[in-house]
C-alpha cells in the first residue's frame, strides 16, 4: 500500500482552521489478523529521512490521534482530549484521512507527517508516511484564508476553513 499527500504546503493566516489530508491506497489485506492504524505527528526538516523524528501535535502523541480499523473502513476520533486541543482526525471510505487544526497560531508552523501502520498478529509493523509543511502567517503578508499548494504541480488552491 502507499500514502499520497494531496498538498505539500499549506499557508494559512493565524486564527484560521486547516485540514491536512493524506490518501491511503493500494492493495489492502483484510485478513482477521491485520489492523491498520492511521495517525499524525510532527517532525522536523533537515533530517536524513523525512518524518523519522516524532514530536507531538499540540502536546498530543500519535497514539492520542490515531484511527484504527481493518481495511478501508471509515473512522474518526471523537476524543474529548483531541477536541480540547482543537484537533480532530478523520477517515473516509475512500482512503482519505485528515487532521483538522482549529484556531491556528504561529506555533503550529512546521512539518506534519501522516502515517499508516499495518500490524499483523498484533506484532510486526509495516509503515508508510507522507509529509507536508504548514506555514502559519500573521500581519499584512498573510493570506486571507488558507492556500494549499499541490504536491505534484505549482498551481495553488484556496481551501475553505474546516
Amino acid at each position: 500500500f502507499k500514502v499520497a499527500t494531496l498538498y505539500s504546503l499549506y499557508v494559512c493566516p493565524e486564527g484560521q482552521n486547516v485540514t491536512l489530508t493524506c490518501r491511503f491506497f493500494g492493495p489492502v489485506d483484510k485478513g482477521h489478523d491485520v489492523t491498520f492504524y492511521k495517525t499524525w505527528y510532527r517532525s522536523s526538516r533537515g533530517e536524513v529521512q523525512t518524518c523519522s523524528e516524532r514530536r507531538p501535535i499540540r502536546n498530543l502523541t500519535f497514539q492520542d490521534l490515531h484511527l484504527h480499523h481493518g481495511g478501508h473502513q471509515a473512522a474518526n476520533t471523537s476524543h474529548d482530549l483531541a477536541q480540547r486541543h482543537g484537533l480532530e482526525s478523520a477517515s473516509d471510505h475512500h482512503g482519505n484521512f485528515s487532521i483538522t487544526m482549529r484556531n491556528l497560531t504561529l506555533l503550529d508552523s512546521g512539518l506534519y507527517c501522516c502515517l499508516v501502520v499495518e500490524i499483523r498478529h498484533h506484532h510486526s509493523e509495516h509503515r508508510v508516511h507522507g509529509a507536508m509543511e504548514l506555514q502559519v502567517q500573521t500581519g499584512k503578508d498573510a493570506p486571507s484564508s488558507c492556500v494549499a499548494y499541490p504536491s505534484s504541480s505549482q498551481e495553488s488552491e484556496n481551501i475553505t476553513a474546516a
Epitope: 489485506d29 492504524y37 498478529h121 498484533h122 506484532h123 510486526s124 509493523e125 509495516h126
Partner: antibody, heavy 121, light 112 residues
Framework: QVQLVQSGAEVKKPGASVKVSCKAS????????INWVRQRPGQGLEWIAR????????YYNEKFKDRATLTVDKSTSTAYMELSSLRSEDTAVYFC??????????????WGQGTTVTVSS | NIMMTQSPATLSVSPGERATLSCKSS????????????LAWYQQKPGQAPRLLIY???TRESGVPDRFSGSGSGTEFTLTISSLQSEDFAVYYC????????FGGGTKVEIK
C-alpha cells in the same frame, strides 16, 4: 543528542524491591517506547518489558509480568522499572533502551549505560 | 516465542582478518507485506551498553563503519566484519523484532 541516563548501582537483599530510573533527553520523550532489558553476569540479553510514555501503557514479557512494574514521569522525562521479590538470580545489569516503533515492535536505537543490581543476603 | 541461536559462541580471529558470525531463528522473521527481515545486530564491549550496528538484516546504522555488513533472509543471517580492527573485538548479538523481542546468545570475537 539523544541520550538515556540511568541511575546508579544498587545492592538489595532477597525479597526486597529495586527501582531503576532512566532519564531521557534530546528527543520527545512521550512519543517513543522505552524498553527494559537485562543481562545476567556472563549471559546474553533478555527483554523484560516496554512502556509508551505518552499513555503510560506497559507491555510485559510473561516471565516478568508479576514482578516488574514500569512507570514514567513525563514532567522529568524519566522512565522507571521496579522489580519486586528479588532473588539472587536477578543479579544483573539492567538497561533501558528506546525503540522506534509506533504500534508493533522495532529495533533498539538508543541504550542507557546500564544499572548494576546485586541481590545478596 | 521466536528462538535465536548464534554460532560460534567464540570466534578467534587475527586483526585484519575476516570474521563471519551466524544467527538462526526458529521461524522466519521475514514480513510478507514489505519483504523486510525484522532482524538487528548489536555490538557490546565489556562494561558498556549494546550498540546498534545493523537493522533490517542488512542496513547499517548511521556512523557504523562499512567493514560491517549483514546478510541473509528468512531464518538464516550472517554478520560479516571484512577486516577486523582492534576496536571490533567484542560480543555481537542478533535480535528479532518481528514478534515481541528475543536475542541470540551472542558470539564473542576475540583476538587470536
Amino acid at each position: 543528542q539523544v541520550q538515556l541516563v540511568q541511575s546508579g548501582a544498587e545492592v538489595k537483599k532477597p525479597g526486597a524491591s529495586v527501582k531503576v530510573s532512566c532519564k531521557a533527553s534530546g528527543y520527545s520523550f512521550t512519543d517513543y517506547y522505552i524498553n527494559w532489558v537485562r543481562q545476567r553476569p556472563g549471559q546474553g540479553l533478555e527483554w523484560i518489558a516496554r512502556i509508551f510514555p505518552g499513555s503510560g501503557n506497559a507491555y510485559y514479557n510473561e516471565k516478568f509480568k508479576d514482578r516488574a512494574t514500569l512507570t514514567v514521569d513525563k514532567s522529568t522525562s524519566t522512565a522507571y522499572m521496579e522489580l519486586s521479590s528479588l532473588r539472587s538470580e536477578d543479579t544483573a545489569v539492567y538497561f533501558c533502551a528506546r525503540d522506534d516503533s509506533f504500534y508493533g515492535y522495532w529495533y533498539f536505537d538508543v541504550w542507557g549505560q546500564g544499572t548494576t543490581v546485586t541481590v545478596s543476603s | 516465542n521466536i528462538m535465536m541461536t548464534q554460532s560460534p559462541a567464540t570466534l578467534s580471529v587475527s586483526p585484519g582478518e575476516r570474521a563471519t558470525l551466524s544467527c538462526k531463528s526458529s521461524q522466519s522473521v521475514l514480513y510478507s507485506s514489505n519483504q523486510k527481515n525484522y532482524l538487528a545486530w548489536y555490538q557490546q564491549k565489556p562494561g558498556q551498553a549494546p550498540r546498534l550496528l545493523i537493522y533490517w538484516a542488512s542496513t547499517r546504522e548511521s556512523g557504523v563503519p562499512d567493514r560491517f555488513s549483514g546478510s541473509g533472509s528468512g531464518t538464516e543471517f550472517t554478520l560479516t566484519i571484512s577486516s577486523l580492527q582492534s576496536e571490533d573485538f567484542a560480543v555481537y548479538y542478533c535480535h528479532q523484532y518481528l514478534s515481541s523481542y528475543t536475542f541470540g546468545g551472542g558470539t564473542k570475537v576475540e583476538i587470536k
